[in-house]
């Protein structure tokens, strides 16, 4: 199994993947296979009303850039006081013995997975964006008795959560064949999107490709600047009883998804007032309604908030509300 896979995003369309070679490979590693698939945003995000008081916006951050090798090692130091000067203690004989046993177990366990759990691929061709080969089928675990898998950092039989897009083993997924290196830049990805990346080490190219159990890692691309900006005009329609219907276009390709809109409006000479429009409310009337406005000149600005944060405010839109009897100063949603 490839060790310590780490992924970071350095742009809104790329993820850099790095890993270390297996500690005890079965034969020579000839190449690595990297598969990736886009993960859907959690369905809860589409349902929740993030305008509700006390409901925090979901925390979605992209995978930050790598630190230098030295600083990584420094951060991973097992024992470190506040001065940061300490090094790890020398290993005892029993620790060394234990590590040798673990290494031996990992090798034996990987052999077992190769021979029992997986059916080898028959052919391998190309490194295109689409995988033309039949994916290796997993045999039913019923065939191999009770197996307890406990390998750190490796999800041999991952559970699919509601956040991931289910992909059947037969489906074509983008992949890359990596030869003579332990890194890959995955390009052409969607901005501020989560990806699940699968990494396998292979020790035979043809005719039968033999690859390790997969190591998995997740990463999110960086946000795209301006992707959350409302494009096009904010339009309005004035109805009876001084009801003003404000309408605007949802950003076409937002960072993740738009969770709410902020409407900021003010009558000339008055203080600014705010209205929060949730996803659902926007969908119902492609905007919002201001009700019972006092007569006068108004300006309105709107901005979208996505999983990555706020977009820019729109240019102000202006409208005039004529005199109308019985008008409490108010707003309709």
């Amino acid at each position: 199994v490839p060790l310590d896979p780490i992924s970071v995003s350095n742009s809104s369309s790329q993820i850099i993947l790095k890993w270390k070679p297996p500690s005890d490979p079965n034969g020579n590693i000839t190449h690595y296979l990297v598969f990736w698939e886009r993960q859907a945003e959690d369905s809860e995000l589409f349902e929740l009303d993030y305008c509700l008081k006390g409901l925090k916006l979901p925390s979605r951050t992209w995978s930050p850039p790598f630190e230098s090798e030295d600083s990584q090692k420094h951060n991973q130091s097992e024992y470190e006081d506040s001065a940061g000067e300490c090094c790890s203690c020398p290993k005892t004989d029993s620790q060394i013995l234990k590590e040798l046993e673990e290494s031996s177990f990992r090798k034996t366990f990987e052999d077992y997975l190769h021979n029992v759990v997986f059916v080898p691929r028959k052919t391998s061709s190309g490194t295109g964006a689409e995988d033309p080969r039949p994916s290796r089928k997993r045999r039913s675990l019923g065939d191999v008795g009770n197996v307890t898998v406990a390998v750190p950092t490796v999800a041999a039989f991952p559970n699919t959560s509601s956040t991931s897009v289910p992909t059947s083993p037969e489906e074509h997924r983008p992949f890359e064949k990596v030869v003579n290196k332990e890194s890959l830049v995955i390009s052409g990805l969607r901005h501020f999107t989560g990806y699940r990346i699968e990494l396998q080490a292979c020790n035979q190219d043809t005719p039968e490709e033999r690859c390790s159990v997969a190591a998995y890692v997740s990463a999110r691309t960086m946000p795209e600047a301006k992707a959350d900006d409302i494009v096009g005009p904010v339009t309005h329609e004035i109805f009876e009883n001084n009801v003003v219907h404000l309408m605007w276009q949802e950003p076409k390709e937002p960072n993740g998804l738009i969770v709410l809109y902020e409407v900021s409006y003010r009558r000339y000479g008055d203080e600014e007032l705010h209205l929060c429009v949730s996803r659902k409310h926007f969908a119902l009337e492609r905007g919002c309604r201001l009700r019972g406005l006092s007569p006068g000149n108004y300006s309105v600005r709107i901005r979208a908030t996505s999983l990555a944060g706020n977009g820019s405010w729109t240019e102000p839109t202006y409208f005039y509300v004529t005199d109308y009897l019985d008008v409490p100063s108010n707003i309709a949603k």
Epitope: C51, F239, K280, A283
Partner: antibody, heavy 118, light 112 residues
Amino acid sequence: EVQLVETGGGVVQPGRSLRLSCAASGFTFSSYAMHWVRQAPGKGLEWVAVISYSGSNKYYADSVKGRFTISRDNSKNTLYLQMNSLRAEDTAVYYCARHEWGFGFDYWGQGTTVTVSS
Amino acid sequence: DVVMTQSPLSLPVTLGQPASISCRSSQSLVYGDGNTYLNWFQQRPGQSPRRLIYKVSNRDSGVPDRFSGSGSGTEFTLKISRVEAEDVGVYFCMQGTYWPGTFGGGTKLEIK
């Protein structure tokens, strides 16, 4: 003047279907989301379903999800509620109402009675 | 769902006297933008509901000024300063802060 007129109610056996209509006039129907709200005999009001101005977004109360379908025809200024697999507990007066979400519903129809009984 | 509890269930009032109906929500109805989406509806016998008050205290056009709404957070009140014969019916509170909107059980106002 805003007017909403419901039709299509009646007596129906459990498990059967019924389709309610709501004809709208006096306002720009295609600009408004629309709701169905019901009231069981001698009981309170219960929100049933809502449809967006264009018909592309629909939401339902858990009690009717999978059985009722809300739809609209903006060219005919008409709202519909297709009710399948009706149960005794669906017996109620059904109202269509114009959307003003945070402010409840600013205009209501006169209602149409649905009785589910064997 | 947010539960709306109204009291009393029944309210017998003498013509010309004041009336007060209480509505309590199971959660605060203050929305993230600071607005409180609490409405009052009147349903006269044999008629459909009609909105009287929106956002706690704002009267709809055409609603007599003897009707007033007040309250905040989870406690709200509808007051009729002098009850008239045409006020007979059932009064419902309804919250629009949380999806889906939910109604109180209703208060039946009748003349003594």
